[in-house]
Amino acid sequence: MMTGTIETTGNISAEKGGSIILQCHLSSTTAQVTQVNWEQQDQLLAICNADLGWHISPSFKDRVAPGPGLGLTLQSLTVNDTGEYFCIYHTYPDGTYTGRIFLEVLESSVAEHGARFQIP
């Protein structure tokens, strides 16, 4: 039975040209995390495998950095990076858990004056 839950940073905003850390955390289960996949809409960004380490998709190598931890750092943000991001936790013996983060990339002036919010 799957008892775990994924906690994420929820809805976040960041400035164009800046960077942001996407973080998820699996709790309430003793399942072992074997792999975490990070996806944006219909594209695979990166994978962190417990045995093999990190794999970054070739098309994102310049703008995606592994970590911290099982998280993912997006760099040189553009307005096109706005959208949904998903962390996919492959675990043993539970199976698969997913978390969702919505990132809004704002023009610098808007980001400076606009409210930033995070949902734990």
Partner: antibody
Framework: EVQLVESGGDLVKPGGSLKLSCAAS????????MSWVRQTPDKRLEWVAI????????YYPDSVKGRFTISRDNAKNTLYLQMSSLKSEDTAMYYC????????????WGQGTSVTVSS | DIQMTQSPASLSVSVGETVTITCRAS??????LAWYQQKQGKSPQLLVY???NLADGAPSRFSGSRSGTQYSLKINSLQSEDFGSYYC?????????FGGGTKLEIK
């Protein structure tokens, strides 16, 4: 060259047991997850079992859970499938396959070994 | 468990045509899907992994795509060696089931 060679297939009576082996060569066996997949007489593919590189994680579909056991001997570069309480619906060609790093998909397959369960 | 609905079950086409085979997942499996080709009397061969990545050795006329829970395998300009059966497989949860298969036959 990656090679996977299955053996142990046979004709067995319902309720019987059988152990399949898969000898691996041409790659670092201990670094890869491995699977058993079977193909039924009507040509459907059914995933049967998966085991992690170190042997500490195993998964099975409900159809074989409690009856089949996947194991590996990394020192011998060999994958096993112990099958018990066999049923007629277990009749199939059984393939062992290597998992591609990171992606679970199976990039190399053996030639298969045939299992027939019939009285 | 996730159900994979593959269509069509069979297809009769001519050399040079373009073909698309689809698999629909009963829920979101993200990029956790592969496509295999199997020729008569042979073992399956990996064509596409992670929904869109072409496997080593697979011809470039094959391509995988994804839209939500629908996954497609496209074969451009079919060659005679492309005839056979095609299967999708998901890697989600704890049961990695295959689609029912598509048999590609020469018209």
């Amino acid at each position: 060259e990656v090679q996977l060679v299955e053996s142990g297939g046979d004709l067995v009576k319902p309720g019987g047991s059988l152990k399949l082996s898969c000898a691996a060569s041409g790659f670092t066996f201990s670094s890869y997850g491995m699977s058993w997949v079977r193909q039924t007489p009507d040509k459907r593919l059914e995933w049967v079992a998966i085991i992690s590189s170190g042997g500490n994680y195993t998964y099975y579909p409900d159809s074989v859970k409690g009856r089949f056991t996947i194991s590996r001997d990394n020192a011998k570069n060999t994958l096993y499938l112990q099958m018990s309480s066999l049923k007629s619906e277990d009749t199939a060609m059984y393939y062992c396959a290597r998992q591609i790093h990171y992606f679970f998909a199976m990039d190399y397959w053996g030639q298969g070994t045939s299992v027939t369960v019939s009285s | 468990d996730i159900q994979m609905t593959q269509s069509p079950a069979s297809l009769s086409v001519s050399v040079g045509e373009t073909v698309t085979i689809t698999c629909r997942a009963s829920e979101n499996i993200y990029s956790n899907l592969a496509w295999y080709q199997q020729k008569q009397g042979k073992s399956p061969q990996l064509l596409v992994y992670a929904a869109t990545n072409l496997a080593d050795g697979a011809p470039s006329r094959f391509s995988g795509s994804r839209s939500g829970t629908q996954y497609s395998l496209k074969i451009n300009s079919l060659q005679s060696e492309d005839f056979g059966s095609y299967y999708c497989q998901h890697f989600w949860g704890t049961a990695y089931t295959f689609g029912g298969g598509t048999k590609l036959e020469i018209k």
